[in-house]
């Protein structure tokens, strides 16, 4: 007998390469100068496969002595990218990822860019600016977001399985209507999580069930009509 488990519904969000930045324009710099210097660390969620631009404190480059970007990624030695204004020289230590670069020449722009953010870019990024007035720094706890792939299928009598595969962080699954559900999480070595929710509906007037997946990258809903109970032929509603 044909089974709706063959009718797999899948969804994967497609994102054109977007760019995200917490940098400010010059007008904002003058307005927010003191505020920004106080906000030393920022948690920043960034979607995977987008471009990210990380900014130093808004210090005029003419007042600068040294700019250093310190990059601490999981399981890797600390990488530093430094620029010394006096000698106009740049130096890198333990930096192997070619996607993490200065936005342009550091004497013109102190910002750091990550081209096509990957899971491996999860970590802490800190810009340290040495000036005659002291050292200023700004840090980012970069959290790479991965959109889960969502599937919905049936595997037995009035039971449906909704999976949010390889999301980061873990997705949350809810159902319409609520069923008798069990949820499991599977953690992967790359930091992604697969969430699997299996639900059963005993109530026979439930025709179609909807799986709603909530995630920081966006929400997704899929629905499927439940198969009849084997042997059930006719009922009045």
């Amino acid at each position: 007998q044909p089974n709706n488990s063959l009718m797999l519904q899948t969804s994967k969000e497609n994102h054109a390469l977007a760019s995200s930045s917490l940098c400010m324009d010059e007008k904002q710099i003058t307005q927010n100068y003191s505020k920004v210097l106080a906000e030393v660390n920022t948690s920043w969620p960034v979607k995977m496969a987008t471009n990210a631009v990380l900014c130093c404190p808004p210090i005029a480059l003419r007042n600068l002595i040294i700019i250093t970007w310190e990059i601490i990624l999981r399981g890797q030695p600390s990488c530093t990218k430094a620029y010394k204004k006096e000698t106009n020289e740049t130096k890198e230590t333990n930096c192997t990822d070619e996607r993490i670069t200065w936005v342009s020449r550091p004497d013109q722009n102190s910002d750091l860019q990550i081209r096509t953010v990957a899971i491996t870019h999860d970590g802490y990024y800190r810009c340290i600016m040495v000036t005659p007035d002291g050292n200023f720094h700004r840090g980012y706890h970069l959290q790479v977001l991965v959109t889960p792939e969502v599937t919905l299928f049936q595997n037995r009598n009035r039971t449906a399985v909704c999976k949010a595969v390889a999301g980061k962080p873990a997705a949350h699954i809810s159902w319409i209507p609520e069923g008798d559900c069990a949820t499991k999480q599977e953690y992967w070595s790359n930091g992604t999580v697969t969430v699997k929710s299996t639900c059963h509906w005993e109530v026979h007037n439930v025709s179609t069930v909807t799986c709603h997946v909530s995630h920081l990258t966006g929400n997704k809903s899929l629905y499927i009509e439940l198969l009849p109970v084997p042997g059930a032929k006719k009922s009045a509603k």
Partner: antibody, heavy 114, light 107 residues
Framework: QVQLVQSGAEVKKPGASVKVSCKAS????????MHWVRQAPGQGLEWIGN????????NYDEKFQGRVTMTVDTSTSTAYMELSSLRSEDTAVYYC???????WGRGTLVTVSS | DVQMTQSPSSLSVSVGDRVTMTCQAS??????LHWFQQKPGKAPKLLIS???NLEDGVPSRFSGSRYGTAFTLTISSLQPEDIATYFC?????????FGQGTKLEIK
């Protein structure tokens, strides 16, 4: 692309029966519920019932229980809806729909008149 | 049975208007639904499936959203060809039930 082709218009006398057909193509006929709804002239839509071609399982709305019979012919991917003991208030356009209500036939006008 | 209350039942509109209509399930029952457009003598045309998914070929001025157990269909800028009756269909529970429709009329 799912297509549902319905039979032509019918004129029936009160007390008679009518059988409307709906031939499906473009999807696995036996894997999706087929629903029937109707719309009386100038009125809203009402659900009559559904049938699962893979097993013959059926649900009828109580309002039509005893007067409606839904069947399928899986060899031709055709669903049928028969309504008996017709009365004037059964005059309506009858639609078949599948794929969780996202694919509809064009409708069959059934006129009950003495 | 789950009753679907649709409002308003009719609406006088002008070209370019932003038009909004709502469907709500009885007793605030959580459901899922589709939105359809119907013109006289024609079969209903699916606009929005599963509350918020715009169907292929449907202009982007149409959008659907869910607010708790209430559902909204919005036409951002009404065009002359949008004059029709719109209705919702809840497909979560048997019997499936329809909203009574919102008829758009030109002012």
């Amino acid at each position: 692309q799912v297509q549902l082709v319905q039979s032509g218009a019918e004129v029936k006398k009160p007390g008679a029966s009518v059988k409307v057909s709906c031939k499906a193509s473009g999807h696995t006929f036996t894997s999706y519920w087929m629903h029937w709804v109707r719309q009386a002239p100038g009125q809203g839509l009402e659900w009559i019932g559904n049938i699962y071609p893979g097993s013959g399982s059926i649900n009828y709305d109580e309002k039509f229980q005893g007067r409606v019979t839904m069947t399928v012919d899986t060899s031709t991917s055709t669903a049928y809806m028969e309504l008996s003991s017709l009365r004037s208030e059964d005059t309506a356009v009858y639609y078949c729909l599948t794929m969780t209500g996202t694919s509809w036939g064009r409708g069959t006008l059934v006129t009950v008149s003495s | 049975d789950v009753q679907m209350t649709q409002s308003p039942s009719s609406l006088s509109v002008s070209v370019g208007d932003r038009v909004t209509m709502t469907c709500q399930a009885s007793q605030g029952t959580p459901i899922n639904l589709h939105w359809f457009q119907q013109k006289p003598g024609k079969a209903p045309k699916l606009l929005i499936s599963g509350a918020s998914n715009l169907e292929d070929g449907v202009p982007s001025r149409f959008s659907g959203s869910r607010y708790g157990t209430a559902f909204t269909l919005t036409i951002s800028s009404l065009q002359p060809e949008d004059i029709a009756t719109y209705f919702c269909l809840q497909f979560t529970y048997i019997p499936w039930t329809f909203g009574q429709g919102t008829k758009l009329e030109i002012k």
